[in-house]
Amino acid sequence: DAEFRHDSGYEVHHQKLVFFAEDVGSNKGAIIGLMVGGVVIA
């Protein structure tokens, strides 16, 4: 996890999320996502 402090003093937290492709289809491997402020953006 990481934390970024902006000039405004507002802190934005981001967290790496790992999902398995197998859960949503027949592919193998991991899918990496990024959650920023509670929203998955990647």
Epitope: Q15, V18, F19, D23, A30, G33
Partner: nanobody
């Protein structure tokens, strides 16, 4: 949910190996992605490794990649973790956990069922 019981922990010297086992009860074991987490004294529980329902895919924390290997045997309702080249910083209580389909498999709160943990101590 499944009930999980870990075993195989112990005291080992740096550079040594251990094999952890996790026995699951219940007929639904094969529908869960399974993971190993660890918690050192005074620290948060952290992700170590995870494996898909079929065993076809795995994912590891960077800190254990190349040293630890997760596997499972759905016929035996069991998950294993082979731990090689152990370091003092690997000392922790290790937990086996079961995650629902579609969960983020590196996040402890995404797991529904947990074992009681097994202590691993790496020290000379």
């Amino acid at each position: 949910e499944v009930q999980l019981v870990e075993s195989g922990g112990g005291l080992v010297q740096p550079g040594g190996s251990l094999r952890l086992s996790c026995a699951a009860s219940g007929r639904t074991f094969s529908i869960y992605n399974m993971g190993w987490f660890r918690q050192a004294p005074g620290k948060e529980r952290e992700f170590v490794a995870t494996i898909t329902r079929s065993g076809g895919s795995t994912y590891y924390a960077d800190s254990v990649k190349g040293r630890f290997t997760i596997s499972r045997d759905n016929a035996k309702n069991a998950v294993y973790m082979q731990m090689n080249s152990l370091k003092p910083e690997d000392t922790a209580v290790y937990y086996c956990a079961a995650a629902r389909i579609g969960a983020a498999v590196n996040i402890p709160s995404e797991y529904d069922s947990w074992g009681q943990g097994t202590q691993v101590t790496v020290s000379s």
